[in-house]
């Protein structure tokens, strides 16, 4: 049956273009190293937004780049995407791989639809 990853169906990005959601996976109990990949699906195309590997026992920030930040706690991962614009609206899929030790497991979430609404520009004031 494979491992499943659970994530919310819908998230609304903030006015600053930031969206966060939790990705939770079914733990096999002995995974020490877990790789999390954020994928964006547009039509039939799937593109990688960001990815990182973390050590389960560390329970700390494992991902911090210009696009994503991530913190882990056990079998839950809190993912934040920043810099989103209206064009970034789409389905964001959480992929979790239990990398070490064997056995290898992979779980794909059903995706989180992130809605991004660009703020209206402020009218010029005289």
């Amino acid at each position: 049956k494979g491992m499943h990853a659970a994530q919310p169906a819908v998230v609304l990005a903030s006015s600053r273009g930031v969206a966060s959601f939790v990705c939770e996976y079914g733990s096999s109990g002995n995974a020490a190293e877990v790789r999390v990949t954020m994928l964006r699906q547009a039509g039939s195309q799937m593109t990688e937004v960001c990815a990182a590997t973390y050590t389960v026992e560390d329970e700390l920030a494992f991902l911090d780049d210009s696009t994503c930040t991530g913190t882990s706690s056990g079998n839950k991962v809190n993912l934040t995407i920043q810099g989103l614009r209206a064009m970034g609206t789409g389905l964001y899929i959480c992929k979790v791989e239990l990398m070490y030790p064997p056995p290898y497991y992979v779980g794909m979430g059903n995706g989180t639809q992130i809605y991004v609404i660009d703020p209206e520009p402020c009218p010029d004031s005289d």
């Epitope: 590997t53 056995p103 497991y105």
Partner: antibody, heavy 114, light 108 residues
Framework: EVQLVETGGDLVKPGGSLRLSCVAS????????MNWVRQAPEKGLQLVGG????????YYTDAVKGRFTISRDNAKNTVYLQMNSLRAEDTAMYYC???????WGQGTLVTVSS | QAVLNQPASVSAALGQRVTISCNTN??????VQWYQQLPGKSPKTIIY???NRPSGVPVRFSGSKSGSTATLTIAGIQAEDEADYYC???????????FGSGTQLTVL
């Protein structure tokens, strides 16, 4: 472009030693535990063993336990396979691969013969 | 010890659909991966986690797993699909990864 390049394969006599290297590029090597897999001539694939991303933990198949050692140097993006007490049955193409087998090298040939 | 059993060879005409089975003698709960090995080349992952296809792998390749049998399906065989195909999973008895014996696919 992701690349794994194995080197060090050679013809060696039974009882001899050899060290294989696998240099990675095009991905964050330190994020990936690594495996070594071998394939005897005209035969199937067999796992040799693996190492975690930090290099602190390893595992081996029974056929090589006590003879082979896997290590890595993340600063050099390299994983190693030290092979001692080599036997004729160790003759194979040796591949390195990421622990999820997503990426594979092109292999290096080890021949053990007197 | 669990063994992943595959047919030694299968053949199919160009454009046909072919399936390759991978049977384990235990009802393994573990994920199955499939690899394609073209003549003289290193293996390439074509299916991971039973049914997931890496980017770049043609959509004609698909995988499934039910009970103790995993299946690789190639819908609409192309000449370039002629290769050896290996399944791989995890075996508690050896506490490690095991590979099937491989299936040679011939395109007629």
């Amino acid at each position: 472009e992701v690349q794994l390049v194995e080197t060090g394969g050679d013809l060696v006599k039974p009882g001899g030693s050899l060290r294989l290297s696998c240099v990675a590029s095009g991905f964050t090597f330190s994020d990936y535990p690594m495996n070594w897999v071998r394939q005897a001539p005209e035969k199937g694939l067999q796992l040799v063993g693996g190492i975690n991303s930090g290099g602190s933990a390893t595992y081996y198949t029974d056929a090589v336990k006590g003879r082979f050692t896997i290590s890595r140097d993340n600063a050099k993006n390299t994983v190693y396979l030290q092979m001692n007490s080599l036997r004729a049955e160790d003759t194979a193409m040796y591949y390195c691969a990421t622990s999820n087998f997503q990426y594979w090298g092109q292999g290096t040939l080890v021949t053990v013969s007197s | 010890q669990a063994v992943l059993n595959q047919p030694a060879s299968v053949s199919a005409a160009l454009g046909q659909r072919v399936t390759i089975s991978c049977n384990t003698n235990i009802g393994s709960p573990y994920d199955v991966q499939w690899y394609q090995q073209l003549p003289g080349k290193s293996p390439k992952t074509i299916i991971y986690g039973n049914s997931n296809r890496p980017s770049g792998v043609p959509v004609r390749f698909s995988g499934s797993k039910s009970g103790s049998t995993a299946t690789l399906t190639i819908a609409g065989i192309q000449a370039e699909d002629e290769a050896d195909y290996y399944c791989q999973s995890y075996d508690d008895n050896v506490d490690g990864y095991v590979f099937g014996s491989g299936t040679q696919l011939t395109v007629l």
